[in-house]
């Protein structure tokens, strides 16, 4: 049997990287009333180059229609571009109260799984 | 900053689980000529219950149309249901040669990232 298969792989040119955008606090879904903007960092991009033999065969099977995945739950045939570290984000609400939300924004990404 | 965020989470009723299917060797994309069937195990299902504060806000931002992800690279707002262990798969090719492919089939799954 193989190892845990969950260590971060260096993203490099694979496309998996940290991206950043200013977003309205109200769109974060935290329930805080605020008209402020915050910087939200997230991970996106491909991890195709980090695929295992299992992933390559899984992709082949899916492409050939030889695998019947459960409805609405297609298996993923490459590691996922996901945060490996996080940071808190702070902002001011409508009552001028300073709020801090832990582990809200990503600070590093990796191809996981 | 948070930790590595890549440890397997117990899948439980979250939907992420090991699934199994008999598949033709020729559909595995390995380049082997064989008319055999093999048992291929893979992971699929949801990891929604394993979401972090980051994931919940990412899902909210995507749902509100407040985030502009790069084209063709939508960020993933939940951990991924991925193999955490693998096993070899063996079969006979058309020349009656016994072939073994390492780490081809999953033996355990987890919500990674």
């Amino acid at each position: 049997a193989g190892g845990p298969g969950s260590r971060p792989r260096a993203a490099g040119a694979r496309g998996c990287r940290l991206r950043s955008q200013l977003v309205p606090v109200r769109a974060l879904g935290l329930g805080h009333r605020s008209d402020e903007l915050v910087r939200f960092r997230f991970c996106s991009g491909s991890c195709r180059r980090a695929r295992s033999p299992h992933d390559l065969s899984l992709a082949s099977l899916l492409g050939a229609g030889a695998l019947r995945p459960p409805p609405g739950s297609r298996p993923i045939s490459q590691p996922c571009c996901r945060p490996t570290r996080y940071e808190a984000v702070s902002f001011m609400d409508v009552n001028s109260t300073w709020r801090t939300v832990d582990r809200l924004s990503a600070t590093a990404c990796g191809c996981l799984g | 900053a948070g930790g590595p965020g890549s440890r397997p989470r117990a899948a439980g009723a979250r939907g992420c689980r090991l699934r199994s299917q008999l598949v033709p060797v020729r559909a595995l994309g390995l380049g082997h000529r064989s008319d055999e069937l093999v048992r291929f195990r893979f992971c699929s299902g949801s990891c929604r219950r394993a979401r972090s504060p980051h994931d919940l806000s990412l899902a909210s931002l995507l749902g509100a149309g407040a985030l502009r992800p790069p084209p063709g690279s939508r960020p993933i707002s939940q951990p991924c249901c991925r193999p955490t262990r693998y096993e070899a798969v063996s079969f006979m090719d058309v020349n009656s040669t016994w072939r073994t492919v390492d780490r081809l089939s999953a033996t355990a799954c987890g919500c990674l990232g």
Partner: antibody, heavy 122, light 107 residues
Framework: EVQLVESGGDLVQPGGSLKLSCAAS????????MHWVRQASGKGLEWVGR??????????EYGASVKGRFTISRDDSKNTAYLQMNSLKIEDTAVYYC?????????????WGQGTMVTVSS | DIQMTQSPSSLSASVGDRVTITCRAS??????LNWYQQKPGKAPNLLIY???TLESGVPSRFSGSGSGTDFTLTISSLQPEDFEIYYC?????????FGQGTKVEIK
């Protein structure tokens, strides 16, 4: 739409004064720091100064070339920041940009105004 | 004050070329380094935040790297709209300071 609009730029004589305004719309900037950056024609970017938010007691800092002559203020109720420029010199001639810097572990010039031209000439 | 030195001050390149601009800080600034693009008559626009984070809406051909004192902005395949001026900027210490700029021109 999130934007900053500067106003107040003008032609002024050396030694004169001018007050620039920067109005934010589409968001509230009370939690953010407000900076001013200037750029002389054909030259690079120069940081002028900043005013921090209420949490930091509206602390101000200035670049060496304007310290003691320029004053930054803000009115959060009006979503507006100001740059009061006194004892103006010919070398203060530039496009002046107001910039919002949202709170973060690492800060950047996040939202820029379109700039307003200040010309100091006799 | 922290001095930021960009090189080259200008460069000539063709569409499709790979272009690298470097920025050196006079002291260590960790990853408190941002990159901006400025078009004529316009305000600068943030491209890369915190040394390597791509700002949303910025094409993936732009990338940033480095930490400490040495930083790099790379454009993997130059496009016609990329022929502009680029600035690095540190936010490690007040006063925040910029590099002198790099003008990318058509060869």
């Amino acid at each position: 739409e999130v934007q900053l609009v500067e106003s107040g730029g003008d032609l002024v004589q050396p030694g004169g004064s001018l007050k620039l305004s920067c109005a934010a719309s589409g968001f509230t900037f009370s939690g953010s720091a407000m900076h001013w950056v200037r750029q002389a024609s054909g030259k690079g970017l120069e940081w002028v100064g900043r005013i921090r938010n209420k949490v930091h007691r509206y602390a101000t800092e200035y670049g060496a070339s304007v310290k003691g002559r320029f004053t930054i203020s803000r009115d959060d109720s009006k979503n507006t920041a100001y740059l009061q420029m006194n004892s103006l010199k010919i070398e203060d001639t530039a496009v002046y940009y107001c910039v919002v810097v949202v709170p973060g572990s690492i800060e950047a010039f996040d939202i820029w105004g379109q700039g307003t031209m200040v010309t100091v000439s006799s | 004050d922290i001095q930021m030195t960009q090189s080259p001050s200008s460069l000539s390149a063709s569409v499709g070329d790979r272009v690298t601009i470097t920025c050196r800080a006079s002291q260590s600034i960790s990853t408190y380094l941002n990159w901006y693009q400025q078009k004529p008559g316009k305000a600068p626009n943030l491209l890369i935040y915190a040394a390597s984070t791509l700002e949303s809406g910025v094409p993936s051909r732009f990338s940033g790297s480095g930490s400490g004192t040495d930083f790099t902005l790379t454009i993997s395949s130059l496009q016609p709209e990329d022929f502009e001026i680029y600035y690095c900027q540190q936010s490690y210490n007040i006063p925040w300071t910029f590099g002198q700029g790099t003008k990318v021109e058509i060869k």
